[in-house]
């Protein structure tokens, strides 16, 4: 049978020929009568056999990491007969390991993020080195990790490569650390090979700093003319934290001011002081408010860092603005009777300079030839007024500071012209009427009405009468209807066109004013031949034709 021991060849042997071992048949008596042959991948190129002795040699440098075993076949032949002495057999050559590979960190680059102020023992990251040597061959691939850089803040577990925190770190002092880890094979014994890697450890922020005002006092100014909502200045607190942890909210301490407010600009983290209510220099020319600042997001476990909010004092000076005159009233309404003489008193307006210097005021009335105003604000008429022409005047009064004519205020002035009874009532239209020759007595021939241009406090009431002469003339009579109308009636039977073709009746109309005014109004009555119909329509037609110059039969 075949005789051999297990074959091992050390890797990386530099000799041209390295004896591995011997293959032999137990029938071989050493007289060189047998021939040994090597078959299979690597036979002749990597391994050779001494055909006479069966000694096997490696003739090439081997790399265990490339290939760690070779399966070859062996034959032994009797030279005399050419026959196989033993059946063909497989055998294995194993390549034994030497420590020729250093540990390598394959997952580089390493980067980790850990919250600042994390307690000792907090896991940061695990680094893993790989060694291509045989893990089953002694300690060639047994690794030990150590820290070359990173003390005293970090430590590494020697066998696992787990990096942990060994001392609390403050991001506000240093926000990142480079840690250098070494991996050594041979569990660190002499002759060990090593590899290193760098780990960038970044500290993430926690909210361990409250915002603090840089200034203990801010001085701001606001113009008294500033509208509400005006930004009058900014205040700024600083927070050593970053991102969300540095977001802050500004506010005014309770009961400090109803006049100002602070809003937070979350882009810039500034506090913007705004005017909440208009200020008046003459009323109050300075204010003092206390502002405070707090972080927007504070987890419960970090409240210990935020016990007392930072505060600052803000002094706000109100700037005086030369303000226009201020009228006592927003508008004025005066009354004056019509027909009062020129220079009559209408009313008094008053404006004052709200500023401290109290400039004298000059007044004027815009676009008016009817009224005057003097420097005391007294308004008088400059012309006689007629209510029946204009019952109301809508004017504008301007007050100007004497020392600064650019400071002007204007307000409306309404003057109502009051009525006096200065117009008598009149016919509401021109009346011309007709009576038939054959008209009977008591026949209504016209209804009349009157108008009065005066304004009546109560309702107008008119009184109708015939003049004294016409009362004595018994041809017509008048009846007052008591409703500001009257009717004219015939006071006889029959009229003669030839004898008296036209009557002119004088009618007196009186009003109920004090004193009462009366006017005389003429009513024209034509006599006409109405035929048997007795219709004044025919009469009207005839008159119309006559007036056009036609002759009727």
């Amino acid at each position: 049978g075949w005789v051999w021991n297990q074959f091992f060849v050390p890797e990386e042997m530099n000799t041209t020929s390295h004896h591995i071992g011997q293959l032999r048949s137990d029938l071989d008596n050493g007289n060189n009568s047998f021939q040994y042959k090597l078959l299979g991948a690597g036979a002749g190129s990597t391994f050779i056999i001494d055909e006479r002795t069966g000694d096997i040699y490696a003739i090439q440098k081997l790399d265990r990491e490339e290939r760690s075993l070779y399966i070859l076949r062996a034959q032994v032949i009797d030279i005399a007969t050419g026959r196989a002495v033993e059946p063909e057999s497989e055998f294995v050559i194993k390549v034994s390991d030497i420590n020729d590979n250093e540990p390598k960190f394959l997952d580089e680059p390493y980067e980790a993020i850990v919250p600042e102020m994390s307690p000792e023992g907090t896991l940061v990251i695990q680094v893993t080195a790989s060694d291509a040597d045989d893990p089953s061959s002694g300690n060639n691939a047994r690794l030990l990790y150590s820290l070359l850089q990173g003390q005293p803040y970090f430590s590494v577990e020697p066998t696992t490569g787990v990096i942990r925190i060994s001392s609390k770190m403050d991001r506000e002092l240093q926000d990142e650390y480079w840690v250098i880890i070494q991996a050594k094979d041979m569990i660190g014994q002499p002759g060990a090979l090593s590899g290193t890697t760098s780990v960038l450890i970044k500290l993430s922020d926690v909210n361990d700093n409250k915002p603090i005002f840089k200034e203990s006092l801010y001085r701001l100014t606001v113009s008294e003319s500033a509208p509400t909502g005006t930004s009058i200045g900014t205040i700024m607190a600083y927070d050593n934290d970053i991102g969300e942890n540095a977001e802050m909210d500004y506010s005014i301490e309770e009961d400090d001011s109803q006049t100002f407010d602070i809003i937070t600009n979350h882009e810039t983290q500034e506090g913007i002081v705004i005017l909440k209510k208009k200020v008046d220099f003459e009323h109050q020319n300075h204010y003092g408010i206390r502002a405070k600042v707090k972080n927007h997001h504070v987890p419960e476990q970090l409240m210990k860092y935020h016990t007392e909010a930072s505060t600052t004092f803000i002094k706000i000076q109100v700037e005086d603005v030369d303000e226009p005159p201020l009228f006592l009233l927003p508008y004025y309404v005066f009354e004056v009777f019509e027909e009062t003489p020129q220079g009559s008193f209408v009313g008094v307006v008053s404006a004052t300079d709200p500023d401290n210097r109290k400039s004298p005021i000059r007044y004027s009335i815009t676009r008016s030839k009817v009224f005057n105003i003097n420097d005391n604000g007294t308004i008088t008429t400059s012309n006689s007024l007629d209510r029946e022409i204009s019952a109301w005047y809508n004017l504008s009064i301007t007050a100007t500071e004497k020392y600064n004519i650019e400071q002007i205020s204007s307000i409306p002035l309404y003057v109502q012209v009051l009525n006096i009874n200065d117009h008598a009532p009149e016919f509401s239209q021109y009346y011309e009427t007709y009576v038939c020759e054959n008209a009977g007595s008591g026949q209504v021939i016209q209804t009349i009405s009157a108008v009065d241009r005066d304004e009546s406090i109560e309702e107008h009431h008119f009184y109708f009468n015939l003049s004294v002469e016409d009362t004595n003339n018994s041809s017509f009579t008048i009846i007052d209807n008591q409703d500001n109308t009257a009717v004219i009636l015939t006071n006889r039977t029959g009229f003669n066109l030839q004898e008296e073709p036209v009557f002119y009746i004088s009618i007196l109309i009186a009003d109920n004013g004090i004193p009462s005014l009366t006017s005389t109004n003429t009513l024209t009555i034509h006599v006409c031949d109405c035929g048997d119909s007795g219709s004044t329509q025919t009469c009207q037609y005839q008159e119309l034709v006559l007036s056009m110059g036609f002759k009727t039969e």
Epitope: L39, A41, A43, E66, R73, L106
Partner: antibody, heavy 120, light 108 residues
């Protein structure tokens, strides 16, 4: 798991050099115990081993192609490449890259293959 | 070089039947160094069996391999429709590494 992907021109002129690259993903080309191999298959025919390389640079070629073949490796890119010079129409084939277990010699996994046509 | 001869060149069977594919080596090959592959049209070969009889990851147990020396066999105990493909054997026992010419397994 490890995946392989061939890339390169699909058409090469006769007498020129065919160049292909195999990109390894899901694992390191620098792992011990593996060869990185090229195999080809002529249209409608069987498989022919071209050669392989160990990541440290040692190469093994099929004697029938040895004079024209160069296989190289770029560990920084996790790639290995094939160059076949002086090509003729007989080199028209689907070219595969594959990982070989160095101790026992089986191919697993394979790339999906790329057809290279040699034509003027 | 070791020449691997596969037979038959084409095998026509129906689903459910047993398939036996042969691979003969021109020289003795270590059983550790023989593998089988399956290739479907338009796809790369896929490892089925390594070391003569070991199934690769994810390969159903209907596939089995056997043999030694110069004669090796791939057996598919009960054919499924997806098993119809070309099968190649491959050796690593001697340089150059070689493949058989393939057996085409087709549906009858």
């Amino acid at each position: 798991q490890v995946q392989l992907q061939e890339s390169g021109p699909g058409l090469v002129k006769p007498s020129q050099t065919l160049s292909l690259t195999c990109t390894v993903s899901g694992g390191s080309i620098s792992s011990g115990g593996y060869y990185w191999s090229w195999i080809r298959q002529h249209p409608g025919k069987g498989l022919e081993w071209i050669g392989y390389i160990f990541y440290r640079g040692r190469t093994y070629y099929n004697p029938s192609l040895k004079s024209r073949v160069t296989i190289s490796v770029d560990t920084s890119k996790n790639q290995f490449s094939l160059k076949l010079s002086s090509v003729t129409a007989a080199d028209t084939a689907v070219y595969y890259c594959a990982r070989v277990y160095s101790n026992y010699g089986w191919f697993d996994p394979w790339g999906q293959g790329t057809l290279v046509t040699v034509s003027s | 070089e070791i020449v691997l001869t596969q037979s038959p060149g084409t095998l026509s069977l129906s689903p459910g039947e047993r398939a036996t594919l042969s691979c003969r080596a021109s020289q003795s090959v270590s059983s550790s160094y023989l593998a089988w592959y399956q290739q479907k049209p338009g796809q790369a070969p896929r490892l089925l069996i390594y070391g003569t009889s070991n199934r690769a990851t994810g390969i159903p147990d209907r596939f089995s391999g056997s043999g030694s020396g110069t004669d090796f066999t791939l057996t598919i105990s009960r054919l499924e429709p997806e098993d119809f493909a070309v099968y190649y054997c491959q050796q690593y026992g001697s340089s150059p590494l070689t493949f058989g010419g393939g057996t085409k397994l087709e549906i009858k």
